[in-house]
């Protein structure tokens, strides 16, 4: 495969990775698998710093993350460890809310519009924010 | 000129399998992902599968789902679905199409038939 | 899976007539939807995407409108090359889904 040097168009560059931001609403599935048809992931949130970044780029407005507990614990799409890494949880989130009435809990986390984190319906048709590291092999399969 | 040019149809028995091509031109082929989409004699149109610019992620119809196989060489601009297990139900006119940022199809090619039957 | 459902099916009109075409998603797609024109024997061509975005190089007499789950395609004034049939498609959510068509003929 071939490596990414540089960040596509309309993606924005910082700390070695490229960041796409979404103008429009998906549920959390649905935008895991556009960041993936990117050859992205959904953001995975590492440090204060990318936070900030973020959070700078997003403004006040409900955005989703990589992050989920759909499977029981807590998990970033990437595979970053969740329970040694960063974490900006709204007070008393995540709180797998069932009042809401939609049926279940809140399995998804998403930027709430202060930038700190809550966990919320995975259906909801929030924005997103896909991200793609620079300088990984592009994973181009070998044809058969 | 941006182009995309399908290759590979013809007549098959149920059972069968069969390889589409895609020829792509004009346009930077492995920054886009790419799609198949199909349309049966005097019917509408139906999203098969799509693949990402790199080809590391992939997904499908139910209706295929196991049965074919979308791919792409990115080094000769082209891309590519494999077919097989084929039914009565498979025939029709198979286009490729790149796919946008907003989720839709931009430039499609002429298409090319498949049909299915004994 | 998105069902998307058109009206009318098919529609007989003249030239320079105001031609309206609706699709509804049964659920909401917000703006995810663009809708295709084909002729026969031809490859569909996007007139518009995001709901109500022109593609480049379409006639502006083509508009779009809606968001949620009901959409409207628009002609505003029908030219001789405009009789095709009409498709929308939503890309909001796997799998993407056609509608079933609208074939816009001569009165």
């Known amino acids: 495969g071939s490596e990414r040097t540089c960040c596509p168009v309309n993606w924005v560059e910082h700390e070695r990775s490229c960041y796409w931001f979404s103008r429009s609403g998906k549920a959390w599935a649905d935008a895991d698998n556009y960041c993936r048809l990117e050859d992205a992931h959904l953001v995975v949130v590492t440090s204060w710093e990318e936070q900030k970044f973020v959070q700078h780029h997003i403004g006040p407005v409900n955005t989703w993350m990589g992050l989920h507990d759909q499977n029981g614990p807590w998990k970033w799409v990437d595979g970053t460890d969740y329970e040694t890494g960063f974490k900006n949880w709204r007070p008393e989130q995540p709180d797998d809310w069932y009042g809401h009435g939609l049926g279940g809990g809140e399995d998804c986390a998403h930027f709430t519009d202060d930038g700190r984190w809550n966990d919320d319906v995975c259906q909801r048709p929030y924005r997103w924010v896909c991200e793609t590291e620079l300088d990984k092999a592009s994973q181009e399969p070998p044809l058969l | 000129e941006v182009q995309l040019l399908e290759s590979g149809g013809g007549l098959v028995q149920p059972g069968g399998s069969l390889r589409l091509s895609c020829a792509a031109s004009g346009f930077t082929f492995s920054s886009y992902a790419m799609s198949w989409v199909r349309q049966a004699p005097g019917k509408g149109l139906e999203w098969v599968s799509v693949?990402?610019?790199?080809?590391?992620?992939?997904f499908y119809a139910d209706s295929v789902k196991g049965r074919f196989t979308i791919s792409r060489d990115n080094s000769k601009n082209t891309l590519f679905l494999q077919m097989n297990s084929l039914r009565a139900e498979d025939t029709a006119v198979y286009y490729c199409?790149?796919?946008?940022?907003?989720?839709?199809?931009?430039?499609w090619g002429q298409g090319t038939m498949v049909t299915v039957s004994s | 899976d998105i069902q998307m459902t058109q009206s009318p099916s098919s529609v007989s009109a003249s030239v320079g007539d105001r031609v309206t075409i609706t699709c509804r998603a049964s659920?909401?797609?917000?703006?995810?939807l663009a809708w295709y024109q084909q002729k026969p024997g031809k490859a569909p061509k996007l007139l518009i995407y995001a709901a109500s975005s022109l593609q480049s190089g379409v006639p502006s007499r083509f508009s779009g409108s809606g968001s949620g789950t009901d959409f409207t395609l628009t002609i505003s004034s029908l030219q001789p090359e405009d009789f095709a049939t009409y498709y929308c498609q939503q890309g909001n959510s796997f799998p993407f889904t056609f509608g079933p068509g609208t074939k816009v003929d001569i009165k």
């Open positions: 659920q909401g797609i917000i703006s995810w």
């Open positions: 693949i990402s610019g790199s080809g590391g992620s992939t």
């Open positions: 199409a790149k796919r946008t940022p907003e989720d839709v199809f931009d430039i």
